[in-house]
């Protein structure tokens, strides 16, 4: 009995035309939503003039339907038992699941000012930047609509540069009509224990963002894992959003719509400093902001973002060191709301429910030559927004799963 089930599972989780796994893999049957909470800055003038703590108030959720597009350019390679694809990006605003509209205004850090002043350290260049910032009436903070902040706007300061530069700025710009990849993953035909594991990303086995093992592309994309998952396993996966591979560990047994699943969570150890978790030494890329690699809970992904000083963390700086959140008032981290988890059906390895949570922050530093940053007396890692991307297996699919998979085993 068990051997027959194992044989059937092994056959059905292969990523090739005709299997249950392939159909759901090409186009997810699950509705995936991405909720955003924007950190609205309450005291922009006091921060700019007196280097006060930044008072933020989160506003949200603003919800978008995402990951509704089928994978593109799906190509099997029989020689090395892989399948390659592009994952197209798309986002549709869901007013009924949101507290307001895409036209809602927020006071946020001026992305272009913060980024340019970080990228350009040369004093002559900073004098030019200062002139452009002043001429365009830009400041340390700006008021932007949700749509502008997420998907892009023409920046008035960058627009004054007289030679061609990208003048459109946005946290997720460009997004619609773009695609992530190319991913090349093992289809499992020759070895089911490798199914969905990424072989290459953008044609490479490494990212070129980090040193040593930190640069590796490990595991799957977290949508599924090889079958027969054990509680003792450490599940590795790669997330292009955070420009790194990470891992999840078993936390608890959960019943999801009558299906027994394993809840795997991202542990605090994954965000620890190299002092506590020596494996993380290669995620520490500079010594000043990280206070000699003793700060934790924020990841500098500037190398992955063309030098822009983007820092990824968990929402509300969950699992981050006190020095990171000290200059920010109004944050309330809690595990239940702000951690990431994956609910995995252990027989198939399919992720039937997940909540991926992350926060996008931008570093802003004092600058002698840039007037609007002149009065700052310290560095700030400024929270801009946090997001919660969730998906849960639908009732119909859950019924099918119970009858065809878990029901047959129990």
């Amino acid at each position: 009995g068990d051997l027959l089930i194992q044989k059937t599972i092994k056959k059905q989780v292969v990523l090739e035309e005709g299997t249950i796994a392939f159909k759901n893999w090409v186009k997810t049957g699950t509705e995936v939503y991405r909720q955003f909470w924007i950190f609205d800055v309450q005291n922009p003038q006091e921060v700019m003039m007196n280097s006060s703590n930044i008072q933020v108030k989160q506003r949200g959720p603003y919800t978008y339907r995402v990951r509704f597009l089928a994978k593109e350019n799906v190509t099997q390679d029989a020689e090395d038992n892989t399948v390659s694809f592009l994952q197209p990006n798309g986002a549709i605003f869901e007013p009924s699941l949101s507290v307001g509209t895409e036209a809602d205004n927020f006071t946020v850090l001026n992305l272009a000012v913060a980024a340019a002043s970080h990228i350009y350290q040369n004093q002559f260049v900073q004098m030019i930047l200062n002139s452009l910032i002043n001429k365009s009436k830009s400041s340390m903070f700006q008021v932007r609509t949700l749509r502008e902040l997420l998907w892009g706007y023409r920046d008035p300061f960058l627009s004054l540069v007289p030679y061609p530069v990208t003048t459109t700025v946005g946290l997720f710009y460009p997004y619609n009509n773009t695609a992530d990849g190319v991913y090349k993953v093992f289809n499992g035909k020759d070895n089911i224990s490798k199914v969905a594991i990424i072989d290459t990303y953008k044609g490479k086995r490494n990212l070129s963002y980090w040193e040593s093992h930190c640069d590796m592309i490990n595991g799957t994309d977290a949508a599924s894992f090889p079958p027969f998952v054990e509680k003792s396993q450490v599940l590795q996966f790669f997330s292009s959003d955070i420009c790194r591979s990470i891992y999840a560990v078993f936390e608890s047994d959960v019943n999801l719509k009558g299906i027994p699943v394993y809840r795997f969570v991202l542990p605090s150890k994954a965000f620890a400093s190299p002092v506590e978790n020596p494996d993380n030494y290669c995620f520490c890329t500079e010594k000043i902001i990280s206070k000699n690699c003793t700060s934790y809970g924020v990841l500098d992904i500037s190398k992955c973002k063309e030098g822009r000083p983007v820092y990824i963390s968990l929402p509300h700086f969950l699992y981050a060191s006190p020095d990171v959140s000290e200059p920010i008032d109004g944050l309330n981290p809690n595990e239940e709301e702000h951690r990431t988890y994956l609910d995995i059906e252990p027989i198939t390895g399919f992720t039937l429910q997940f909540a991926k949570r992350l926060q996008v922050n931008l570093l802003v530093k004092p600058s002698e030559k840039i007037q609007v940053l002149k009065n700052l007396k310290r560095n700030y890692i400024v929270p801009i927004l946090w997001l919660n991307e969730t998906g849960t297996i639908g009732d119909e699919k859950a019924n099918m799963f119970r009858s065809q998979v878990t029901g047959k085993i129990n």
């Epitope: 040369n122 002559f124 260049v125 004098m127 002139s131 540069v161 030679y163 530069v165």
Partner: nanobody
Framework: QVQLQESGGGLVQPGGSLRLSCAAS????????MGWFRQAPGKEREFVAA????????YYADSVKGRFAISRDNAKNMVYLQMNSLKPEDTAVYYC???????????????WGQGTQVTVSS
Amino acid sequence: QVQLQESGGGLVQPGGSLRLSCAASGRTFSSYPMGWFRQAPGKEREFVAAIDWSGDITYYADSVKGRFAISRDNAKNMVYLQMNSLKPEDTAVYYCNAGPLDSWERNDFPSWGQGTQVTVSS
């Protein structure tokens, strides 16, 4: 690509003055900051002075501050370096260059002209 041709160098006594000129060809001249650099025998090329695209912002190496003045004429595609109170240590080949902000940040300019020799000696 901006083509650059320096001129105006020569032999001058300490305390004397010279005015260097740089003629630029190419449609992008007025879009880029421009600057002067120099290279003394056996030394690395060093920054001397820079001016932004509009001519509003100038910036000087400490060693020439108060003695040298950079200016530009976008209508004529020219950049100038007025050098006063010259010292023997100003002896070098002087080059001009132009480029986007990235070039200035990285001190990385794709091509250089022939330069013009300035010799300060009694």
